[in-house]
Amino acid sequence: QAGPLPKPTLWAEPGSVISWGNSVTIWCQGTLEAREYRLDKEESPAPWDRQNPLEPKNKARFSIPSMTEDYAGRYRCYYRSPVGWSQPSDPLELVMTGAYSKPTLSALPSPLVTSGKSVTLLCQSRSPMDTFLLIKERAAHPLLHLRSEHGAQQHQAEFPMSPVTSVHGGTYRCFSSHGFSHYLLSHPSDPLELIVSGSLEDPRPSPTRSVSTAAGPEDQPLMPTGSVPHSGLRRHWE
């Protein structure tokens, strides 16, 4: 008795965060024995779509020509081989931006901050929202997720960072959203450039010091509770 078929890999191109009206392609990669691919969308009738494999049969393409609210959500895919259906892929969260007006992102006390000190990024929306997200360009885990407590609607969210180090420098944007669908985000805020100057740091290189890239985990203003990435997309502070 053979074990279960290996789960396929699911991804989106050009990415999983798509502006309204833009095209996106969802790919599901299984094995060369695949005869059919199925894509399921959470809270939609299954299957959401079926596709025959592309040669050499190890993957299938699901095309979305123009991103709208209907396409935002959580997807899984499967493939069928002569011995049956595979395990489900890991989920893909397809997020649409442009659902609401853009918030404003600012830095307190200033976007120019000295290494070793603190800075608070403030994301403000015109209308009350219950979820705010912070993105750092070229970060490995780009989205930080702040949900208002007790479902309260708020006009702003604070993202504290301390101590700030050189890797916190870079370009940030924020989004706002409503709790009923975390897959629908506002337009992005205008970019905020955080500039880290000076240094209170030890100037001596230590033997274990490694080169830190912009994609390193130090980019994240980690929260003391619930700081584990959620489905690879968000970090929670709730």
Epitope: L108, P109, S115, G116, K117, S118, T120, E158, P160, M161, S162, P163, T165, S166, V167, L200, E201, D202, S206, T208, R209, S210, V211, S212, G216, P217, E218, Q220, P221, L222, M223, P224, T225, S227, V228
Partner: antibody, heavy 118, light 107 residues
Amino acid sequence: EVQLVESGGGLVQPGGSLRLSCAASGFTFSSFGMHWVRQAPGKGLEWVAYISSGSSSIYYADTVKGRFTISRDNAKNSLYLQMNSLRAEDTAVYYCARGTGTGAMDYWGQGTLVTVSS
Amino acid sequence: DIQMTQSPSSLSASVGDRVTITCRTSQDISNYLNWYQQKPGKAPKLLIYYTSKLHSGVPSRFSGSGSGTDFTFTISSLQPEDIATYFCQQGNTLPWTFGGGTKLEIK
């Protein structure tokens, strides 16, 4: 469950050296900055040193600068404090603590006692 | 360095009492103020972070407030297990600094 376990404390003569270790488990060690904090017998808490998650940023209290070296090995989930030129006033319980990115330290080890005496 | 002035240094209260500890900083630290509880022979435990956020697993009788330079820590109804020393700590600028502590005793 987050766990931090310090080791390496003991009795050392003034001018001597000691290396403290902190073994971390229950969380993704490589994603968190780490601190050393000490507490002299019957006294308050004193922050000693900080190292960022990727070791790119290191900070020390003025009282230990030039004598202590903080380091980490993310592959081994371990934090270290190399203490040289020890003085009587370095006598304390040394705690390792996990940083949060918000200026707090959310989990602490049980501590290891360092006694500097002739 | 940022100086931390914590008061009172000791406090005696009865079970069920409302207990308040204050912490004043030598410069504005925004909301980067944390509170810890330490019992004899044990490591400190984080109770409150970022002035008013309750750390996971901490009972709701503990709360914090303030901003800038003046901060308050409150136990709404003192329980026997709350007997400990409490410390405030600023996380605004390295080096982190702590208040001198408040030793809380049962009357």
